[in-house]
Structure formats: C-alpha cells, structure tokens
Amino acid sequence: SHMAPTHQLPPSDVRKIILELQPLSRGLLEDYQKKETGVPESNRTLLLCLTSDSQPPRLNSSAILPYFRAIRPLSDKNIIDKIIEQLDKLKFQHEPETEISVPADTFECKSFILTILQQFSACLESVFKSLNSGPQ
C-alpha cells in the first residue's frame, strides 16, 4: 500500500492531522460551553493525552479514543466521528483501548464531557507547539 502504517507517520503528517483536529476540537468545545452554561470542569477526570516515552511528546491516541467513543452518543456525533477518524490515524496498531464509562448523574456527566473537551483542546495545543518548535 502507498500509505505508511498509521503508527509510523512522520512529524509532517502528524502535524497535518493535528491541524485538522484543532478546529474540530475548538468548535466542539465552544458549542458545548454555549449549550451547557454554568457547568464546571470536573477535577476527577484526567485525560492522559500525551505519551511520556517520546520526545517531542506524541498524542496518546489510544488513551483518548475511548473517551470520545464514550461521549459520542451525548454530544455532536458528526464532529465526534470526524475526531475519532483523525485519532484512528495516529493510533499504534496493537495498543489496547480501555473501556470508559460516563457518569450516570446528568450534571456529573455534563461536567465530565466538558472536562474531556477542554483537556483535549489543551493537549492539541501542546503537541502542535512541540511540533513547531522542532528544528524547523
């Protein structure tokens, strides 16, 4: 196949994917904040979105994907599907995905979703900065 295995993409292609993800993530977060005003960020949810074993940091797609699969029925499915599609391209092929359960309480659930979206946006910003600060 012409395409390199998805977990073997060079920094240039990773950067392309991050550039696609940024407006999707930003738009999803802004829409959710408008729709769910007054919902606080949860201090019980931590999205481990960066790998600790690579320099510069790599987006830990396998850790992020389960969260987006979990919140998909409760958010903008169309945008979430686009985000999942991009994250799949960055996933190491044989990395297992953990099962994530969304809080049953409505308010806690909204707080959980908001936290995921906020942390993901911050994470993309961090990875993008690291890709731009390389020896360019």
């Epitope: 012409h2 998805t6 073997q8 993409l9 060079p10 240039s12 392309k16 696609e20 390389g134 020896p135």
Partner: antibody
C-alpha cells in the same frame, strides 16, 4: 486518471499580487492534500504550502506573510495568491496532489511560468 | 529546515551502464523504520514525475531499472541500465518534517 492544470498570468509587475488557479479532474479536492511548488530559474524547487480536503491550509514559513491558498469545491479548483511579489518570485509554478499519509506527491500539473518584471 | 544535498550536480553515463545519484539529508528522515525520502524525474519542459517513494518503493508504472536505497540521512537512486529516455534532472524530496524540501537536482546526460 488524475490531472492537474495550472493557469494564470505569465507576467506580473513587482509589488503586485500573483494569482494562479489549479483545476483538478479525476479526483475531488475534498480528499487528500493539494499543494503548490515552484521551480526557480536556477532549477531549485521550493515547497510553498497546501490546502487540505477540509480546507485547512499550511504554508512554508518563508512565505507565510505573503501566501494564501484557497479553493472552490464546486469547481474542483484551488488557488494560489502571492502578495508583494518581487523579481525573486519569477519561477515555474506547479500544483500537485499528496493523496495519502506517508506517501509522496504523485500527480503534478504541467507547470506555468510566471515572470515578475516591470 | 532539513537541507538535502545531492551529488553529483551532473552526471554523464554511457547507454547500458549504471547511474548512481546520492542525496544526503542534514538530519535523519526516518521514523519507526520508514524513510520519508522520495525521488522524482523531471524531463526538459515537463513536470516532476514520482519514481520512488519512501526511499525504496517503486511507483506504479515505473520501470524496474530504477531503484532506491538508503536510510536515516544517506540515500541513493540507481538507474541500471541507463536508457536514452532517462536524460533528465533527478530530485530527492523529504516529507519527514515541515517545510518539505528538495535536493538541488542531478542532471543526467548520455556519454
């Protein structure tokens, strides 16, 4: 078969804007990445930037303040605008497709020669 | 930016002989065992044509006389045997890091 065709003025005056069109047939610009590359008279090739399937753009930092790539999906065309041109922008301009991650630019237009001169 | 240095700048080879073109990158263009270096052929008055992608993969429709090898910073394009139709300028290009960059080109002539 995928075909790309550049068009636009062959002569541009210094300080003006260079505007080129790339017309694509045999593939949709709503998939893949669509690039501009130029070749200077001394044969040096320079990568300029791209517009993606979703409309995201990214440019060579050496041109960032002067370049803009846009598209019209209904016409299956994408465009290059280069502002404040100088004689140093005299080159043959190519459009090319980058179809798959981890691959290379597999289809190129035939190129259009642009001279910047008063 | 990653600088690609091609050598020689020009090359004259007899028909049926082997042509070898070198491309050296200022830093590694490898990730997880893949080399993001590609080779193009540009004939006079034509656009560049992809020959080899990811260092050693022959593009569809390209004759097996063309071959690519190398990894990290050192890459080679080989044409064996050279035919009259191979007269052109050959360029290497890296897609490892932004901005993508090209080598200065090697002009192949027939002796």
């Amino acid at each position: 078969e995928v075909q790309l065709q550049e068009s636009g003025p062959s002569l541009v005056k210094p300080s003006q804007t260079l505007s080129l069109t790339c017309s694509v047939t045999g593939d949709s610009i709503t998939s893949g990445y669509w690039n501009w590359i130029r070749k200077f008279p001394g044969n040096k090739l320079e990568y300029m930037g791209y517009i993606s399937y979703s409309g995201i753009t990214d440019y060579n930092p050496s041109l960032k303040s002067r370049i803009s790539i846009t598209r019209d999906t209904s016409k299956n065309q994408y465009y290059l605008q280069l502002n404040s041109v100088t004689t140093e922008d005299t080159a043959t301009y190519y459009c090319a497709r980058y179809g798959n991650y981890g691959y290379a630019m597999d289809y190129w237009g035939q190129g259009t020669s642009v001279t910047v001169s008063s | 930016d990653i600088v690609l240095t091609q050598s020689p700048a020009s090359l004259a080879v007899s028909l049926g002989q082997r042509a070898t073109i070198s491309c050296r990158a200022s830093e590694s263009v490898d990730t997880y065992g893949n080399s993001f270096m590609h080779w193009y052929q540009q004939k006079s008055g034509q656009s560049p044509k992809l020959l080899i992608y990811r260092a050693s993969n022959l593009e569809s429709g390209i004759p097996a006389r063309f071959g690519g090898s190398g990894s990290r910073t050192d890459f080679t394009l080989t044409i064996d045997p050279v035919e009259a139709d191979d007269v052109a300028t050959y360029y290497c290009q890296q897609s490892y890091e932004d901005p993508w960059t090209f080598g200065g080109g090697t002009k192949l002539e027939i002796k």
